[in-house]
Interface confidence: low
Amino acid sequence: KLTIESTPFNVAEGKEVLLLVHNLPQHLFGYSWYKGERVDGNRQIIGYVIGTQQATPGPAYSGREIIYPNASLLIQNIIQNDTGFYTLHVIKSDLVNEEATGQFRVYPELPKPSISSNNSKPVEDKDAVAFTCEPETQDATYLWWVNNQSLPVSPRLQLSNGNRTLTLFNVTRNDTASYKCETQNPVSARRSDSVILNVLYGPDAPTISPLNTSYRSGENLNLSCHAASNPPAQYSWFVNGTFQQSTQELFIPNITVNNSGSYTCQAHNSDTGLNRTTVTTITVYAEPPKPFITSNNSNPVEDEDAVALTCEPEIQNTTYLWWVNNQSLPVSPRLQLSNDNRTLTLLSVTRNDVGPYECGIQNELSVDHSDPVILNVLYGPDDPTISPSYTYYRPGVNLSLSCHAASNPPAQYSWLIDGNIQQHTQELFISNITEKNSGLYTCQANNSASGHSRTTVKTITVSAELPKPSISSNNSKPVEDKDAVAFTCEPEAQNTTYLWWVNGQSLPVSPRLQLSNGNRTLTLFNVTRNDARAYVCGIQNSVSANRSDPVTLDVLYGPDTPIISPPDSSYLSGANLNLSCHSASNPSPQYSWRINGIPQQHTQVLFIAKITPNNNGTYACFVSNLATGRNNSIVKSITVSA
């Protein structure tokens, strides 16, 4: 069937359209195009005779039409009046006619739209604004965008006039946005420039900052006021109702108690004509004096004296606070506060009570601290320590002993040998000693302030022969795979080499064995039962050597998984069942039995005479080592056949 296709169907003014013919019959004489839906000679556009290939314009020919041999018609430079139907009349060779009609629509290319507004400065919660998209264009669709988004759903937004007009009722400050309109028709779409809606609002109730309402005499008062407003608000300050200045900030230096009162900020919007005020009450407090601490005893003696610290000056209706070592007071029966907290008493002072101590006076604004006070606690002397710790020396070396005792004031020292006073020094030095220098060396420490005196006595042996050493241990019963043991070879002797043997052999190489303290200490990490050996230490110098008696390490271990013997699991009825359980363990474990889960006796051997098939079941041996806290068990199945 003969058909006409319009390409495109919607044509923009000034463009071109092709009326494309489909299913053109064979054996044609010619064809003609007509404007309209029927063949009308008055409205013929063009005719075409195939034989002569001659095209003849008709009355409706505008000069913009071109006919093709395949009967298609091209119309150029389209105008609005070209809209409508076009009919093709085909004349076949047998003079039988055929007709087909096609159509297209012409639309203008849209101009860039613009937005007009009926109110350039609407007031919040009062005015409405109507935006209109210009120009008005026939057959155009109107769209609106807010901040480049499609219109939100809102009862305050209304479209009218074929969507050409957007009305915002009762505008708010949140309607301050970018508005655009768009026009569309089948051949074009154009968007307007943005229009920013400038909503007048405010002022809101102003906020005064900072929020602080209490000040101390002598400080500066600096208040700032802010109110949300468009255009920005104009500000005025009033103090106790009296106008001060028209600024956003109010600054009063070096305030006094007289500056206390009500401070009002007024915000004014000249466009909306609205005023809002906020009031804050400022209180200025007088500056209290800086506190200080007095003490009833400036040099208390440890464990004897008490000290009373008092916070000055005395002020009525004031809270007193105390700190020790920059911390609040610890709970201690030796610390007592008076009823008004003004006096802190330290009962039976110790050297740790030196402080520093601070007191504070609390007012409405802050706490004023005193300067810190440190107590000079007299103590000691403690028992003096004599160093070095060596007790054995070889003849010919120099003996240099030093004494120290904790004391305040520092102790005075005296040395005695075998009870005879030697010198009043902290150090004692004797060169090139001999066996005759062996004896009791006493250090005496004296505290002149407390009158106390303490002594320490050390036995010094000068001998070419080393003493027989001994081994001390930090753990006499270590647990396997858990504990470490440190053996130390005593005594500590000067210029001495320390040696170790295990079961008569030199130390094996093992990451679990470590020598330290000049080889004087042997540490066994993560002991095992194999470490239960005889350990011997030896000391030697250039002239002598000696060995300790052996110390055997008692390693607690187990219990290991027990073994039930005999291994038989099948018995004849009437036989005796005699099961023995054994588990490697130190100390020996406690044994118990269960038959089919039921507890039996606490023995290593389980004996049942003349067993029957009723004795079939599971026989479990449980072992427990109370020293290691570990348990173990094994289960054996017994079958008795009739």
């Epitope: 795979d481 990451p511 470590q514 020598l515 330290s516 080889n519 993560n526």
Partner: antibody, heavy 120, light 105 residues
Framework: QVQLQESGPGLVRPSQTLSLTCTVS?????????WHWVRQPPGRGLEWIGY???????NYNPSLKSRVTMLVDTSKNQFSLRLSSVTAADTAVYYC?????????????WGQGTTVTVSS | DIQLTQSPSSLSASVGDRVTITCSTS?????MHWYQQKPGKAPKLLIY???NLASGVPSRFSGSGSGTDFTFTISSLQPEDIATYYC????????FGQGTKLEIK
């Protein structure tokens, strides 16, 4: 923090002795621990060589024991490795490492490694 | 000698994947340690004594196991985890696994 730094020649001739030193900073060797050498041939895994303790106690990998000597110098806070009669198979990156123990022994601090090539 | 066998010898995984490496021993050991080695760098301790996280190591790394079978896991693979991972035990003397090379898909 504890740091280990290996040093020594990068090229050793076959049959000669390889000598490397590890300098410890941020920790005193004589305070304890064991001090190890580990090597890694090109493109291969890690092989433990041995360790020395500050007291001079040593323990070597059985496969290298006959050729390895380790020494410690607590005054310089250093320990060293000597590997004699080297061949091309001894070409590797050599690391020194500190051993820590939490009842179990592992290497918690390593040097950045030094490359040793055995070639004529 | 106790032999350590790691599997797989290499693996490729995506960021965010859970990655598991196993280490089998020729006889029973009481613990296992794990190290990470990035190209050209020294090994770094990640896990000690089977399951303890070394200081400063992210919590996505973990370890478990006992006897002869031990496992090392990265719960959510990160790009910076590209490295070779070694298991390590110390019985008579220290030995290491042959290593597992981890790559990002």
């Amino acid at each position: 923090q504890v740091q280990l730094q290996e040093s020594g020649p990068g090229l050793v001739r076959p049959s000669q002795t390889l000598s490397l030193t590890c300098t410890v900073s941020g920790f005193t060797i004589s305070s304890g621990y064991s001090w190890h050498w580990v090597r890694q041939p090109p493109g291969r895994g890690l092989e433990w060589i041995g360790y020395i303790q500050y007291s001079g106690i040593t323990n070597y990998n059985p496969s290298l024991k006959s050729r390895v000597t380790m020494l410690v110098d607590t005054s310089k806070n250093q320990f060293s490795l000597r590997l004699s009669s080297v061949t091309a198979a001894d070409t590797a990156v050599y690391y020194c490492a500190r051993e820590d123990y939490d009842y179990h022994w592992y290497f918690d601090v390593w040097g950045q490694g030094t490359t040793v090539t055995v070639s004529s | 000698d106790i032999q350590l066998t790691q599997s797989p010898s290499s693996l490729s995984a995506s960021v965010g994947d859970r990655v598991t490496i196993t280490c089998s021993t020729s006889s029973s050991v009481s613990y296992m340690h794990w190290y990470q080695q990035k190209p050209g760098k020294a090994p770094k301790l990640l896990i000690y004594s089977t399951s303890n996280l070394a200081s400063g190591v992210p919590s996505r790394f973990s370890g478990s196991g006992s006897g002869t079978d031990f496992t090392f896991t990265i719960s959510s693979l990160q790009p910076e985890d590209i490295a070779t991972y070694y298991c390590h035990q110390w019985s008579s003397y220290p030995t290491f696994g042959q290593g597992t090379k981890l790559e990002i898909k």
